[in-house]
């Protein structure tokens, strides 16, 4: 389960209400840190394990998830034609 | 290089506690979950207890359940392990033990028993009258 | 409970398997000499620590580990104990133990 925690924001600046965000998530057993919809997520260790990302879900609602060649990464593909990768080092 | 180098054995008397502890260097202590296991004397391994890397999850073997708290000191890099209530059947070695999957930060993050890829090199422990 | 043979033996050259079965998430394999530390020779199913021999291999089908020594050398003679976490997936477990004797 994953949670967003506002760190703190610019009170220097009254107009500005930006504020730095970060998850926080506890795995279960048998899960790791993972993407999940563009999000961090616990995800089931064993798709990491084999490099199936898009077993996670990794990307947007809509998007169409595709490994990279050698299971390095995966890209997502918008509807419009966009493409966005990430790689996993 | 990894080191986990456990201290606090030694003869304990029936009833009696102790507190183990592993300092554990060349690596980043906080994202690893920890584990101690411990082998009776001509026996097999036995789980005892494991702890999340940032220490707010903890579980126990059935056999020290009630009698024994895991704890960690991220900033001083030190695994504890507390038991109370000693008897004869807790002799035996107690090896501290590292889960090889590195939680990066914001994660808390169980380790897995069969992801454990350091051992430290044991406290005995003897309990007896 | 973990399922693994209490011994298995080889002759030095030849290959020795040991199975381990009844646990979920991932297998690691430790070897222990008598006097001596506890080694990991496989962990997360089939990997394998930089210091170890490649004549250790690990593979995962189903619920069951196979730890395979391929060419057995005399200082291979050891207990092997596997590890995972128990059925429920709340804790760890550890198997009885299998004694390889190298002929």
């Known amino acids: 389960t994953c949670e967003i925690v506002t760190l703190d924001r610019d009170s220097s600046q009254p107009r500005r209400t930006i504020a730095r965000q970060t998850a926080r998530c506890a795995c279960r057993k048998g899960q790791i840190a993972g993407t999940t919809r563009a999000r961090p997520a616990c995800v089931d260790a064993r798709i990491i394990k084999t490099k199936q990302w898009c077993d996670m879900l990794p990307c947007l609602e809509g998007e169409g998830c595709d490994l990279l060649i050698n299971r390095s990464g995966w890209t997502c593909t918008q509807p419009g034609g966009r493409i966005k990768t990430t790689t996993v080092s | 290089a990894v080191t986990l180098d456990e201290s606090g054995g030694g003869l304990q008397t029936p009833g009696g506690a102790l507190r183990l502890s592993c300092s554990a260097s060349?690596?980043?202590?906080?994202?690893?979950?920890m584990f101690w296991v411990r082998q009776a004397p001509g026996k097999g391994l036995e789980y005892v207890s494991e702890?999340?890397?940032?220490?707010?999850?903890?579980n126990y073997g059935s056999a020290v359940k009630g009698r024994a708290t895991i704890s960690r000191d991220n900033g001083q890099s030190t695994l504890y392990l507390q038991m109370n209530s000693l008897r004869a059947e807790d002799t035996g070695t107690y090896f501290c033990?590292?889960?090889?999957?590195?939680?990066?930060?914001?994660?808390?993050?169980?380790?897995?028993?069969?992801?454990?890829?350091?051992w430290g090199h044991g406290t005995e422990v003897i309990v007896s009258s | 409970a973990l399922t693994q043979p209490s011994s298995v033996s080889a002759n030095p050259g030849e290959t020795a398997k040991i199975t381990c079965s009844g646990g979920?998430?991932?297998y690691g394999w430790f070897q222990q000499k008598p006097g001596s530390a506890l080694v990991t020779v496989i962990y997360?199913?089939?990997e394998r620590p930089s210091d170890i021999p490649s004549r250790f291999s690990g593979a995962l089908s189903g619920s069951t580990n196979t730890l395979t020594i391929t060419g057995v050398q005399a200082e291979d003679e050891a207990d092997y104990y596997c590890?995972?976490?128990?059925?429920?997936?709340?804790?760890?477990?550890f198997g009885a133990g299998t004694t390889l004797t190298v002929l």
């Open positions: 997360w199913d089939d």
């Open positions: 979920v998430y991932s």
């Open positions: 060349g690596f980043d202590f906080s994202s690893h979950g």
């Open positions: 590890g995972t976490e128990d059925i429920s997936g709340t804790a760890g477990v």
């Open positions: 033990a590292r889960s090889t999957y590195e939680c990066p930060g914001g994660f808390s993050c169980w380790g897995d028993t069969g992801q454990i890829d350091a």
């Open positions: 702890i999340t890397n940032d220490g707010s999850g903890t």
